[in-house]
């Protein structure tokens, strides 16, 4: 499991008495997302490394729907709209936590799961390996 | 809460009998991260919209450490290394689920929380609103 820093009343996750199964309230609290006026909504189109969003659905997972980014080009889009293949569009990936039903189909028992998702794309200079 | 699609044995979260509090096993299962040979490790430096990574720590949250991206420039880096301010470096943001201790300091009781994190940056063409 992920280590939780030692805190009064919160034993470290490495301790043998740290709870491996906990109670989780599923009434989600939106901490700071609702106050943000400009989300990344149209960046996928305006980026020099544009991407498409694909719906990944799994009823055994919570949340069941995750959107995955897939870069549109191998290269990056120039000001004139053409693709520059001397640069690379690459996905920015992030590990996120989801809840996986365990045992399967069980309505109130889950296991934490770490999955890697592509959030968007960025344009990078390629690594060029020079032969000696 | 997030709606979980109707499934045999899994009532919809809108149903009054859907469990608002569930059991979660904290032994994290790494689903597909170990098989990924190229993580975004050096993209933050090689991107035309480079970013720095900052450690966001909160002992009341699970995971307690989240890395946040912050773009280095308002503009984007050109091939010659100078910054082009006619383009914009913008953070790619994603809503993620975390567990928040509730009540505070309680070792085995959590609430699901949605937070918005910046994962990396991308270079976009600015929106220009033309006055009629």
């Amino acid at each position: 499991g992920i280590a939780i820093p030692r805190n009064s009343g919160c034993p470290n996750s490495e301790d043998k008495n740290f709870p491996r199964t906990v109670m989780v309230n599923l009434n989600i609290h939106n901490r700071n997302t609702s106050t943000n006026p400009k989300r990344s909504s149209d960046y996928y189109n305006r980026s020099t490394s544009p991407w498409n969003l694909h719906r990944n659905e799994d009823p055994e997972r919570y949340p069941s729907v995750i959107w995955e980014a897939k870069c549109r080009h191998l290269g990056c889009v120039k000001a004139d709209g053409n693709v520059d293949y001397h640069m690379n569009s690459v996905p920015i990936q992030q590990e996120i936590l989801v809840l996986r039903r365990e045992p399967r189909h069980c309505p109130n028992s889950f296991r934490l799961e770490k999955i890697l998702v592509s959030v968007g794309c960025t344009c990078v200079t390629p690594i060029v390996h020079h032969v000696a | 809460g997030i709606a979980i699609p109707r499934n045999s044995g899994c009532p919809n979260s809108e149903d009054k009998n859907f469990p608002r509090t569930v059991m979660v096993n904290l032994n994290i299962h790494n689903r597909n991260t170990s098989t990924n040979p190229k993580r975004s490790s050096d993209y933050y430096n090689r991107s035309t919209s480079p970013w720095n990574l900052h450690r966001n720590e909160d002992p009341e949250r699970y995971p307690s450490v989240i890395w946040e991206a912050k773009c280095r420039h308002l503009g984007c880096v050109k091939a010659d290394g100078n910054v082009d301010y006619h383009m914009n470096s913008v953070p790619i943001q994603q809503e993620i689920l975390v567990l928040r201790r509730e009540p505070r300091h309680c070792p085995n009781s959590f609430r699901l929380e949605k937070i918005l994190v910046s994962v990396g940056c991308t270079c976009v063409t600015p929106i220009v609103h033309h006055v009629a």
Epitope: R31 | Y85, V90, L116
Partner: antibody, heavy 126, light 112 residues
Framework: EVQLVESGGGLVQPGGSLTLSCAAS?????????MCWVRQAPGKGLEWIGC????????YYASWAKGRFTISRDNSKNTVYLQMNSLRAEDTAVYYC??????????????????WGPGTLVTVSS | DIQMTQSPSSLSASVGDRVTITCQAS??????LSWYQQKPGKAPKLLIY???TLTSGVPSRFSGSGSGTDFTLTISSLQPEDFATYYC??????????????FGGGTKLTVL
């Protein structure tokens, strides 16, 4: 409700110090918000003092404010502070706390301030 | 530091008029400019950011244009609630030591 409330204003003697607080509610500092301080002398225009990134603690100041004014934050209390030293009569003003409109990871507070507190009056006089 | 020069400093107009306020930066700030409206005894209200992007909830009669050093705020048809003081603000930075967040001197818009 999303709001900012300043406190700590009042009468202070020239040469004295004062610390203003700005308590945020309805949103969390967890992550990157730019929180700024702006002042307005009676009958005058707006004057930017500085900003702090609540995520990494980076501060930005107007050239005239460097050295005498310090901005800090306590994310656990959702509060930003403005410490003012060596106060002068010309520092008399309404001090506003404000939040930059863009959340999360922008290089600088570059999107204007969309949320303001009502302001707190600081009077420097003997 | 970048200086922001706003003109005119005061302006009288009537309901229904088209009003233009200009703001000039002492050096290029690209499109990193915001406009605010302030009424007596109240905190400023953000109208426009990034030179031309209207803040949510602001009426479409307000518009902004310009880039580099010259910027304009236009109110296409003045309404009674628009009489106030307007400020421009630069929001440009290249490093923490050269971040410029400067307000213009303000334009007081009064009833003719």
């Amino acid at each position: 409700e999303v709001q900012l409330v300043e406190s700590g204003g009042g009468l202070v003697q020239p040469g004295g110090s004062l610390t203003l607080s700005c308590a945020a509610s309805g949103f969390s500092f967890s992550g990157f918000y730019y929180m700024c301080w702006v002042r307005q002398a009676p009958g005058k225009g707006l004057e930017w003092i500085g900003c702090i990134d609540t995520g990494d603690g980076t501060t930005y100041y107007a050239s005239w404010a460097k050295g005498r004014f310090t901005i800090s934050r306590d994310n656990s209390k959702n509060t930003v502070y403005l410490q003012m030293n060596s106060l002068r009569a010309e520092d008399t003003a309404v001090y506003y706390c404000a939040r930059d409109a863009a959340y999360g990871g922008y290089a600088y507070p570059a999107h204007g301030m969309d949320l303001w507190g009502p302001g707190t009056l600081v009077t420097v006089s003997s | 530091d970048i200086q922001m020069t706003q003109s005119p400093s005061s302006l009288s107009a009537s309901v229904g008029d088209r009003v233009t306020i200009t703001c000039q930066a002492s050096e290029s700030i690209y499109r990193y400019l915001s406009w605010y409206q302030q009424k007596p005894g109240k905190a400023p209200k953000l109208l426009i950011y990034l030179a031309s992007t209207l803040t949510s909830g602001v009426p479409s009669r307000f518009s902004g244009s310009g880039s580099g050093t010259d910027f304009t705020l236009t109110i296409s048809s003045l309404q009674p609630e628009d009489f106030a003081t307007y400020y421009c603000q630069s929001n440009f930075g290249t490093a923490s030591t050269t971040y410029y967040n400067t307000f213009g001197g303000g334009t007081k818009l009064t009833v003719l």
